[in-house]
Protein backbone atom coordinates (compact mmCIF):
# COMPACT_ATOMS: atom_id res chain seq x y z
CA UNK A 1 0.00 0.00 0.00
CA UNK A 2 1.19 3.25 -0.68
CA UNK A 3 1.29 6.23 2.14
CA UNK A 4 3.52 8.42 1.04
CA UNK A 5 2.88 11.80 0.09
CA UNK A 6 4.96 13.94 -2.64
CA UNK A 7 5.27 18.06 -1.11
CA UNK A 8 6.39 19.98 -3.64
CA UNK A 9 7.43 24.03 -3.94
CA UNK A 10 4.08 23.88 -5.97
CA UNK A 11 3.48 27.28 -8.50
CA UNK A 12 6.39 28.92 -8.50
CA UNK A 13 7.49 32.44 -10.91
CA UNK A 14 10.81 33.55 -11.69
CA UNK A 15 12.34 36.34 -13.46
CA UNK A 16 13.59 35.80 -17.22
CA UNK A 17 17.83 35.34 -17.08
CA UNK A 18 17.53 33.89 -13.27
CA UNK A 19 17.61 31.03 -11.53
CA UNK A 20 14.91 28.76 -9.80
CA UNK A 21 15.48 25.56 -7.32
CA UNK A 22 12.41 22.84 -8.25
CA UNK A 23 11.66 21.07 -5.28
CA UNK A 24 10.19 17.81 -4.34
CA UNK A 25 9.86 15.59 -0.91
CA UNK A 26 8.82 12.09 -0.20
CA UNK A 27 7.31 12.22 3.46
CA UNK A 28 4.96 9.90 5.25
CA UNK A 29 6.65 6.37 4.14
CA UNK A 30 9.50 4.40 5.05
CA UNK A 31 10.19 3.30 1.50
CA UNK A 32 13.26 3.84 -0.12
CA UNK A 33 13.90 5.95 -2.74
CA UNK A 34 16.20 4.61 -5.39
CA UNK A 35 15.80 6.89 -8.26
CA UNK A 36 14.35 10.36 -9.03
CA UNK A 37 13.97 11.40 -12.37
CA UNK A 38 13.16 15.29 -13.15
CA UNK A 39 11.11 15.77 -16.19
CA UNK A 40 9.87 18.49 -18.48
CA UNK A 41 6.46 19.63 -19.29
CA UNK A 42 6.99 17.98 -23.24
CA UNK A 43 8.60 14.66 -20.88
CA UNK A 44 12.07 15.58 -22.00
CA UNK A 45 14.21 14.71 -19.16
CA UNK A 46 15.88 16.87 -17.20
CA UNK A 47 17.73 14.87 -14.76
CA UNK A 48 18.35 11.92 -13.08
CA UNK A 49 19.12 11.38 -9.35
CA UNK A 50 20.34 7.45 -8.24
CA UNK A 51 20.52 6.54 -4.63
CA UNK A 52 23.78 4.30 -5.94
CA UNK A 53 25.36 6.46 -8.73
CA UNK A 54 24.78 9.89 -8.08
CA UNK A 55 23.37 12.50 -10.74
CA UNK A 56 23.07 12.94 -14.42
CA UNK A 57 22.22 15.98 -16.14
CA UNK A 58 20.99 15.32 -19.76
CA UNK A 59 23.02 17.04 -22.12
CA UNK A 60 20.88 19.29 -23.61
CA UNK A 61 20.45 21.13 -20.12
CA UNK A 62 24.24 20.80 -19.52
CA UNK A 63 24.77 24.23 -19.43
CA UNK A 64 21.52 25.32 -17.73
CA UNK A 65 20.79 22.33 -14.96
CA UNK A 66 22.63 21.98 -11.24
CA UNK A 67 22.35 19.34 -9.56
CA UNK A 68 20.27 20.10 -6.07
CA UNK A 69 20.08 20.97 -3.47
CA UNK A 70 19.44 17.69 -2.52
CA UNK A 71 17.48 15.45 -4.46
CA UNK A 72 16.21 18.72 -6.28
CA UNK A 73 17.25 20.86 -9.49
CA UNK A 74 18.38 24.07 -10.00
CA UNK A 75 17.41 25.63 -13.18
CA UNK A 76 19.32 28.83 -14.08
CA UNK A 77 19.55 31.35 -17.21
CA UNK A 78 15.82 31.40 -17.44
CA UNK A 79 14.14 31.40 -21.03
CA UNK A 80 10.06 32.16 -21.61
CA UNK A 81 10.67 28.72 -23.12
CA UNK A 82 10.83 27.43 -19.52
CA UNK A 83 7.57 28.18 -18.28
CA UNK A 84 5.23 25.16 -17.96
CA UNK A 85 4.78 22.03 -15.55
CA UNK A 86 7.76 20.05 -14.13
CA UNK A 87 7.45 16.24 -12.83
CA UNK A 88 9.71 14.47 -10.42
CA UNK A 89 9.38 11.19 -9.92
CA UNK A 90 10.32 9.38 -7.31
CA UNK A 91 10.81 5.64 -7.48
CA UNK A 92 10.75 3.53 -4.35
CA UNK A 93 11.26 0.51 -2.84
CA UNK A 94 8.64 -1.18 -1.78
CA UNK A 95 5.82 1.50 -2.34
CA UNK A 96 6.84 2.36 -6.13
CA UNK A 97 6.21 5.29 -7.94
CA UNK A 98 5.53 8.65 -6.98
CA UNK A 99 5.26 11.88 -8.85
CA UNK A 100 5.22 14.74 -8.09
CA UNK A 101 4.29 18.26 -10.25
CA UNK A 102 5.36 21.65 -10.22
CA UNK A 103 4.32 24.63 -12.47
CA UNK A 104 7.08 27.28 -13.11
CA UNK A 105 6.20 30.63 -14.72
CA UNK A 106 8.62 32.84 -16.32
CA UNK A 107 8.20 36.52 -16.23
CA UNK A 108 9.37 39.34 -18.58
CA UNK A 109 8.97 41.44 -15.77
CA UNK A 110 10.39 42.03 -12.49
CA UNK A 111 8.28 40.39 -10.27
CA UNK A 112 9.17 38.91 -7.14
CA UNK A 113 9.85 35.07 -6.83
CA UNK A 114 7.49 33.62 -4.98
CA UNK A 115 6.95 30.14 -3.72
CA UNK A 116 3.76 28.37 -2.25
CA UNK A 117 4.39 24.93 -0.56
CA UNK A 118 1.54 22.45 -0.71
CA UNK A 119 0.79 18.67 -0.93
CA UNK A 120 -0.32 17.48 -4.65
CA UNK A 121 -2.48 14.38 -5.61
CA UNK A 122 0.29 11.31 -5.95
CA UNK A 123 0.34 9.28 -8.94
CA UNK A 124 1.51 5.25 -7.45
CA UNK A 125 2.08 2.10 -9.15
CA UNK A 126 3.12 -1.40 -8.25
CA UNK A 127 6.79 -1.81 -7.98
CA UNK A 128 7.48 -4.63 -10.45
CA UNK A 129 11.65 -4.82 -10.08
CA UNK A 130 12.16 -7.70 -7.45
CA UNK A 131 15.89 -7.78 -7.97
CA UNK A 132 16.35 -4.29 -6.98
CA UNK A 133 14.86 -4.54 -3.51
CA UNK A 134 18.51 -6.17 -2.03
CA UNK A 135 20.51 -2.43 -3.39
CA UNK A 136 19.11 0.21 -2.01
CA UNK A 137 20.15 2.33 0.83
CA UNK A 138 18.47 5.51 1.85
CA UNK A 139 19.56 8.64 0.86
CA UNK B 1 35.06 -7.54 -9.57
CA UNK B 2 32.89 -5.14 -11.56
CA UNK B 3 33.02 -7.31 -15.13
CA UNK B 4 30.82 -7.53 -18.46
CA UNK B 5 31.30 -10.97 -20.05
CA UNK B 6 30.06 -11.55 -23.71
CA UNK B 7 29.06 -15.01 -25.41
CA UNK B 8 27.10 -16.64 -28.02
CA UNK B 9 29.16 -15.37 -30.89
CA UNK B 10 30.34 -17.58 -33.81
CA UNK B 11 29.89 -18.53 -37.06
CA UNK B 12 26.26 -18.56 -39.23
CA UNK B 13 24.88 -18.07 -42.75
CA UNK B 14 23.24 -14.91 -44.12
CA UNK B 15 19.71 -15.03 -42.98
CA UNK B 16 20.57 -16.66 -40.05
CA UNK B 17 19.97 -15.65 -36.11
CA UNK B 18 22.08 -15.40 -33.08
CA UNK B 19 21.67 -14.47 -29.61
CA UNK B 20 24.26 -12.61 -27.99
CA UNK B 21 25.10 -12.76 -23.64
CA UNK B 22 26.41 -9.97 -21.88
CA UNK B 23 26.86 -11.12 -17.65
CA UNK B 24 27.34 -8.19 -15.84
CA UNK B 25 28.86 -8.36 -11.94
CA UNK B 26 30.28 -6.35 -9.59
CA UNK B 27 27.35 -3.55 -9.51
CA UNK B 28 23.90 -2.71 -9.36
CA UNK B 29 23.02 -3.65 -13.05
CA UNK B 30 19.44 -2.69 -13.30
CA UNK B 31 20.59 0.93 -13.09
CA UNK B 32 22.43 1.02 -15.97
CA UNK B 33 21.64 2.13 -19.54
CA UNK B 34 23.39 -0.18 -21.47
CA UNK B 35 24.90 -0.99 -25.20
CA UNK B 36 26.06 -2.95 -27.68
CA UNK B 37 28.97 -2.00 -30.00
CA UNK B 38 30.48 -3.79 -32.75
CA UNK B 39 33.69 -3.26 -34.43
CA UNK B 40 34.23 -4.78 -37.91
CA UNK B 41 37.94 -6.42 -38.96
CA UNK B 42 40.17 -3.66 -39.23
CA UNK B 43 36.96 -1.14 -39.47
CA UNK B 44 36.32 1.47 -35.89
CA UNK B 45 33.48 1.39 -33.56
CA UNK B 46 29.95 1.20 -34.78
CA UNK B 47 27.18 1.94 -31.96
CA UNK B 48 23.94 -0.93 -32.34
CA UNK B 49 22.30 0.35 -29.81
CA UNK B 50 21.14 0.41 -26.22
CA UNK B 51 18.81 -0.12 -23.85
CA UNK B 52 17.64 1.91 -20.75
CA UNK B 53 17.00 1.38 -17.14
CA UNK B 54 13.51 0.05 -16.18
CA UNK B 55 13.40 3.23 -13.90
CA UNK B 56 14.20 5.12 -17.03
CA UNK B 57 11.57 3.12 -18.79
CA UNK B 58 13.37 0.73 -20.23
CA UNK B 59 13.19 1.74 -23.92
CA UNK B 60 15.69 0.66 -26.38
CA UNK B 61 17.53 2.74 -29.31
CA UNK B 62 19.16 1.52 -32.33
CA UNK B 63 21.55 2.50 -35.09
CA UNK B 64 19.79 2.65 -38.97
CA UNK B 65 21.94 -0.49 -39.95
CA UNK B 66 20.59 -2.93 -37.81
CA UNK B 67 16.65 -1.45 -37.15
CA UNK B 68 14.09 -4.22 -37.37
CA UNK B 69 16.80 -6.91 -37.46
CA UNK B 70 18.37 -6.41 -33.92
CA UNK B 71 16.36 -6.30 -30.72
CA UNK B 72 18.19 -5.78 -27.55
CA UNK B 73 16.42 -6.49 -23.78
CA UNK B 74 17.84 -7.35 -20.52
CA UNK B 75 16.88 -9.72 -18.01
CA UNK B 76 17.78 -7.43 -14.53
CA UNK B 77 17.17 -10.47 -11.67
CA UNK B 78 19.84 -12.22 -13.75
CA UNK B 79 22.01 -9.53 -14.11
CA UNK B 80 22.41 -10.04 -18.36
CA UNK B 81 22.05 -8.23 -21.53
CA UNK B 82 21.16 -9.66 -24.43
CA UNK B 83 21.43 -9.22 -28.25
CA UNK B 84 19.28 -10.99 -30.59
CA UNK B 85 20.50 -11.22 -34.25
CA UNK B 86 18.32 -11.65 -37.15
CA UNK B 87 18.35 -11.93 -40.93
CA UNK B 88 22.21 -11.61 -40.35
CA UNK B 89 24.11 -9.79 -43.45
CA UNK B 90 27.76 -10.71 -44.10
CA UNK B 91 28.70 -6.84 -43.36
CA UNK B 92 27.16 -8.23 -40.10
CA UNK B 93 30.83 -9.88 -39.41
CA UNK B 94 32.31 -7.75 -36.53
CA UNK B 95 33.75 -8.07 -32.87
CA UNK B 96 30.96 -7.41 -30.65
CA UNK B 97 31.16 -5.14 -27.16
CA UNK B 98 28.21 -4.37 -24.23
CA UNK B 99 28.97 -1.34 -22.52
CA UNK B 100 27.46 0.41 -20.02
CA UNK B 101 26.35 4.04 -21.28
CA UNK B 102 28.68 6.88 -19.65
CA UNK B 103 25.56 8.57 -17.61
CA UNK B 104 27.27 8.50 -13.95
CA UNK B 105 30.48 9.37 -12.81
CA UNK B 106 30.17 5.82 -11.02
CA UNK B 107 29.66 2.84 -12.97
CA UNK B 108 30.68 4.79 -16.63
CA UNK B 109 32.27 3.57 -19.35
CA UNK B 110 32.59 -0.56 -18.45
CA UNK B 111 32.99 -3.02 -21.88
CA UNK B 112 33.28 -6.58 -22.03
CA UNK B 113 36.60 -8.51 -23.56
CA UNK B 114 34.11 -8.83 -26.79
CA UNK B 115 32.67 -11.71 -28.93
CA UNK B 116 33.38 -12.44 -32.43
CA UNK B 117 30.30 -12.69 -34.77
CA UNK B 118 31.02 -14.11 -38.58
CA UNK B 119 28.60 -14.43 -40.53
CA UNK B 120 29.61 -16.32 -43.91
CA UNK B 121 28.08 -18.87 -46.32
CA UNK C 1 21.86 10.45 -40.15
CA UNK C 2 24.26 12.22 -37.50
CA UNK C 3 28.15 11.92 -38.26
CA UNK C 4 31.10 12.64 -36.74
CA UNK C 5 34.82 13.50 -38.64
CA UNK C 6 38.03 13.02 -37.12
CA UNK C 7 41.27 13.17 -38.64
CA UNK C 8 42.32 9.92 -39.50
CA UNK C 9 45.96 9.94 -38.19
CA UNK C 10 48.30 12.40 -36.83
CA UNK C 11 51.34 12.26 -35.26
CA UNK C 12 53.30 14.28 -32.55
CA UNK C 13 57.16 14.26 -30.52
CA UNK C 14 57.10 12.70 -27.13
CA UNK C 15 56.78 15.23 -24.48
CA UNK C 16 54.60 17.71 -27.07
CA UNK C 17 50.87 18.13 -26.63
CA UNK C 18 48.28 16.20 -29.27
CA UNK C 19 45.02 17.94 -29.78
CA UNK C 20 42.22 15.47 -32.05
CA UNK C 21 39.63 17.32 -33.28
CA UNK C 22 35.64 15.80 -33.60
CA UNK C 23 33.30 17.76 -35.00
CA UNK C 24 29.41 17.64 -35.77
CA UNK C 25 26.62 19.38 -36.16
CA UNK C 26 26.14 20.92 -33.12
CA UNK C 27 28.02 18.42 -31.00
CA UNK C 28 27.99 21.26 -28.12
CA UNK C 29 24.09 20.19 -27.21
CA UNK C 30 25.19 16.68 -26.88
CA UNK C 31 28.11 15.05 -24.27
CA UNK C 32 31.02 14.15 -26.44
CA UNK C 33 33.32 11.41 -24.73
CA UNK C 34 36.47 9.77 -26.08
CA UNK C 35 37.96 6.19 -26.27
CA UNK C 36 41.64 4.89 -26.41
CA UNK C 37 42.33 1.36 -28.52
CA UNK C 38 45.19 -0.26 -28.70
CA UNK C 39 45.58 -3.26 -31.28
CA UNK C 40 43.83 -6.88 -29.88
CA UNK C 41 42.14 -4.88 -27.03
CA UNK C 42 39.09 -3.31 -26.03
CA UNK C 43 38.46 0.58 -26.15
CA UNK C 44 38.89 2.40 -23.05
CA UNK C 45 37.40 5.25 -21.87
CA UNK C 46 38.72 7.86 -21.36
CA UNK C 47 37.32 11.58 -21.48
CA UNK C 48 33.23 11.55 -21.18
CA UNK C 49 30.64 14.10 -20.16
CA UNK C 50 32.95 16.45 -22.44
CA UNK C 51 36.03 16.96 -19.82
CA UNK C 52 35.58 14.62 -16.80
CA UNK C 53 38.30 11.89 -16.83
CA UNK C 54 37.11 8.69 -15.10
CA UNK C 55 39.28 7.07 -12.63
CA UNK C 56 42.53 5.96 -13.39
CA UNK C 57 42.65 8.03 -16.74
CA UNK C 58 46.15 10.49 -15.88
CA UNK C 59 45.90 13.91 -15.77
CA UNK C 60 47.68 14.36 -19.03
CA UNK C 61 43.74 13.38 -20.93
CA UNK C 62 41.61 16.43 -20.59
CA UNK C 63 38.64 17.45 -22.91
CA UNK C 64 36.78 20.35 -24.04
CA UNK C 65 33.28 20.49 -26.35
CA UNK C 66 31.41 23.43 -27.82
CA UNK C 67 29.62 24.80 -30.75
CA UNK C 68 30.68 22.36 -33.59
CA UNK C 69 33.55 20.75 -32.30
CA UNK C 70 34.93 18.78 -29.49
CA UNK C 71 38.93 18.29 -28.68
CA UNK C 72 40.68 15.52 -26.95
CA UNK C 73 44.10 17.15 -25.69
CA UNK C 74 47.06 15.03 -24.25
CA UNK C 75 49.45 17.07 -22.79
CA UNK C 76 53.23 15.58 -22.36
CA UNK C 77 52.14 12.50 -25.11
CA UNK C 78 54.01 9.34 -23.65
CA UNK C 79 55.10 6.50 -26.13
CA UNK C 80 52.05 4.63 -24.57
CA UNK C 81 49.57 6.66 -25.96
CA UNK C 82 50.30 5.48 -29.64
CA UNK C 83 46.27 4.12 -30.28
CA UNK C 84 43.53 4.98 -32.22
CA UNK C 85 41.39 7.48 -30.36
CA UNK C 86 37.32 7.27 -31.21
CA UNK C 87 35.00 10.44 -30.24
CA UNK C 88 31.42 10.30 -29.48
CA UNK C 89 28.51 11.71 -29.37
CA UNK C 90 26.09 10.74 -26.63
CA UNK C 91 22.79 11.91 -25.59
CA UNK C 92 19.64 10.23 -24.61
CA UNK C 93 18.31 9.42 -27.98
CA UNK C 94 21.30 8.44 -30.03
CA UNK C 95 25.00 7.63 -29.79
CA UNK C 96 27.45 7.89 -32.71
CA UNK C 97 30.82 7.01 -33.14
CA UNK C 98 33.60 9.07 -34.78
CA UNK C 99 35.79 7.14 -37.72
CA UNK C 100 38.53 7.01 -35.02
CA UNK C 101 42.22 8.85 -35.29
CA UNK C 102 45.47 6.97 -35.20
CA UNK C 103 47.95 8.52 -33.21
CA UNK C 104 51.39 7.80 -34.03
CA UNK C 105 54.27 9.35 -31.23
CA UNK C 106 57.25 9.51 -33.15
Known amino acids: MMTGTIETTGNISAKKGGSVILQCHLSSTMAQVTQVNWEQHDHSLLAIRNAELGWHIYPAFKDRVAPGPGLGLTLQSLTMNDTGEYFCTYHTYPDGTYRGRIFLEVLESSVAEHSARFQIPIEGRDYKDDDDKHHHHHH | EVQLVESGGGLVKPGGSLRLSCAAS????????MSWVRQAPGKGLEWVGRIKSKTNGGTTDYAAPVKGRFTISRDDSKNTLYLQMNSLKTEDTAVYYC????????????WGQGTLVTVSS | SYELTQPPSMSVSPGQTASITCSGDKLGDKYACWYQQKPGQSPVLVIYQDSKRPSGIPERFSGSNSGNTATLTISGTQAMDESDYYCQAWDSSTVVFGGGTKLTVL
Open chain 2, 26 to 33: GFTFSYAW
Open chain 2, 99 to 110: TTDPLYDILTGL
